[in-house]
């Protein structure tokens, strides 16, 4: 997985994909995609979209293309998690979800993908030139990270191509194991996605999916994202930065896993199952840059496969470690 890759080799479905293709054409590509993915090295994709309804609002979607079980997902902004990034959300498949301002809603979309809505105004608000990174910790493959951002002049509501575009490599054994039929299928999938890319946005249809019910298809676009496709171009202020000590909440709290309502720890049971309830409101924990650890004379704490997050009353920090904040 390259954090620098720009080649749009394979992209997650774009908003409006369902409208662009019928149900029949949706099924085959995803079956094929699943097969294509199993042959390669784990990859992470990131998609960033600016919502036109609120110009300071972003939706970040990330997914893991791999066969291992996901232990933890960490979303950060301002750079990768070990290189100056500030943690926005940590999602554990069993212990639940934790988020920090300006994150508004983080949730599991499927067992291997998540979404995060960001909003805000002032110093902590996201902007078009912000880099967002997602790191997936998976057993036994390890930790995989990718980053993406919107170009400064992006049309509101339209998503930037996922960056880095996952490039699915396969070793010789993987290649030999894939039949000609599967190879054709992968090519066909790419053809469908590319063909969709050049289609006009579909006519809007009201979403029939209640947010409280599991969705029939993981990629069904929300009403908000559908509406966003038809809002005129607007420019946004790009002078923003991640919140640091002077803009974040100054006080910590007890270990948040212990206080999570049970619904927040809902684990999706199937590939298309969605976390069915809104997660707790953003916490009042300090979200700081890595450098502050050095001042305290301590190494940035890591969290990992099992996670006991934030027992430290000072709260979580953006850590050098991959799996989350301790």
């Amino acid at each position: 997985m390259r954090t620098e890759a720009q080649v749009p080799a394979l992209q997650p479905p774009e908003p409006g994909l369902e409208g662009a293709m019928g149900h029949r054409t949706l099924v085959l590509p995803w079956v094929l995609l699943t097969l294509c993915v199993t042959a390669g090295t784990p990859e992470v994709w990131v998609q960033v979209r600016m919502e036109a309804t609120e110009l300071s609002s972003f939706t970040i979607r990330c997914g893991f293309l791999g066969s291992g079980s996901i232990s933890l997902v960490t979303v950060s902004w301002g750079g990768p998690n070990g290189a100056g990034g500030t943690t926005l959300a940590v999602l554990h498949p069993e212990r639940g979800i934790r988020q920090w301002a300006p994150a508004r809603q983080a949730r599991w979309e499927t067992q291997s993908s998540i979404s995060l809505i960001l909003e805000g105004s002032g110093a902590s608000s996201p902007c078009a030139n912000t880099t967002f990174c997602c790191k997936f910790a998976s057993f036994p493959e390890g930790s995989w990270e990718a980053c993406g951002s919107l170009p400064p002049s992006s049309d509101p509501g339209l998503s930037a191509p996922p960056t880095p575009a996952p490039i699915l490599r396969a070793d010789l054994a993987g290649i030999l194991g894939v039949s000609g039929v599967l190879l054709f299928g992968c090519v066909y999938l790419l053809h469908l996605l590319r063909r969709h890319k050049h289609r006009p946005a579909p006519r809007l249809q009201p979403s029939r999916t209640s947010p409280q019910a599991p969705r029939a298809r993981a990629w069904a676009p929300s009403q908000a994202s559908q509406a966003a496709l038809h809002v005129p171009y607007a420019t946004i202020n790009t002078s923003c930065r991640p919140a640091t000590l002077d803009t974040a909440h100054p006080h910590g709290g007890p270990s948040w896993w212990a206080s999570l309502p049970t619904h927040a720890a809902h684990r999706p049971q199937g590939p298309a199952a969605w976390a069915s309830t809104p997660i707790p409101a953003r916490g009042s924990f300090v979200s700081v840059e890595n450098g502050l650890y050095a001042q305290a004379g301590e190494r940035p704490p890591h969290t990992g496969p099992g996670l006991t997050l934030f027992p430290d009353p000072r709260g979580p920090r953006a850590m050098e470690g991959p799996l989350g904040v301790r």
Epitope: M1, P140, W144, T303, P322
Partner: antibody
């Protein structure tokens, strides 16, 4: 301070088994995967396998699949590796190493090693 | 399995020198390359992870670079305590594999 304290050197006879330990301290044991690595005398390092202390899941290098068994005891924050049907080829220093759980998939802290000598 | 090759098995240098140790992977490992040092007493420490990120507590005279299949570790100002054997390791696929090591000695 993160520390991995391994059990002492052992001398065993061919055909026997040995179980070595790696006691972790200074961090939450179940939050990091644990690797085991072999270093034969004067040679390079060979990855044996990895265990997730949170749930006991394991993954092995095919070469060591029938040789090593990885386990953990969460209550004592200790990882174990058992080697069976020992031969002279198994004489080596064995290290436990914590997974950094960071991109790069490095091993950020290592035990001091357990020396195993197989001799009749 | 991915093979990791450190072509130089031993290297002699003087204190204060700039030393570069190289490592090559048998396939693209996308920066999933880590560097370790092993002291004569057997102690192993992580120096660099993900090709170029410095591990906590490691002196800034150590740096890593590279991409694709070719990577290098540079010690900008060699000190006595740097005398050790250096190993590279790929974290891109399982099984994890290591280079053969480069033993650094003082002239």
């Amino acid at each position: 301070e993160v520390q991995l304290q391994q059990s002492g050197p052992v001398l065993v006879k061919p055909g026997a088994s040995v179980k070595m330990s790696c006691k972790a301290s200074g961090y939450i044991f179940t939050d990091y995967y644990m690797h085991w690595v072999k270093q034969s005398h004067g040679k390079s390092l060979e990855w044996i396998g990895i265990i997730n202390p949170y749930n006991g899941d394991t993954s092995y290098n095919q070469k060591f699949k029938d040789k090593a068994t990885l386990t953990v005891d969460k209550s004592s924050s200790t990882a174990y590796m058992e080697l069976n049907s020992l031969t002279s080829e198994d004489s080596a220093v064995y290290y436990c190493a914590r997974d950094s759980s960071n991109v790069g998939n490095a091993m950020d802290y290592w035990g001091q090693g357990t020396s195993v000598t197989v001799s009749s | 399995d991915i093979q990791m090759t450190q072509t130089t098995s031993s290297l002699s240098a003087s204190l204060g020198d700039r030393v570069t140790i190289s490592c090559r992977a048998s396939q693209d490992i996308s920066n999933y390359l880590n560097w370790y040092l092993q002291k004569p007493d057997g102690t192993i420490k992580l120096l660099i992870y993900y090709s170029s990120r410095l591990h906590s507590g490691v002196p800034s005279r150590f740096s890593g670079s590279g991409s694709g299949t070719d990577y290098s570790l540079t010690i900008s100002n060699l000190e006595q305590e740097d005398i050790a054997t250096y190993f590279c390791q790929q974290g891109y696929t399982l099984p994890r594999t290591f280079g053969g090591g480069t033993k650094l000695e003082i002239i």
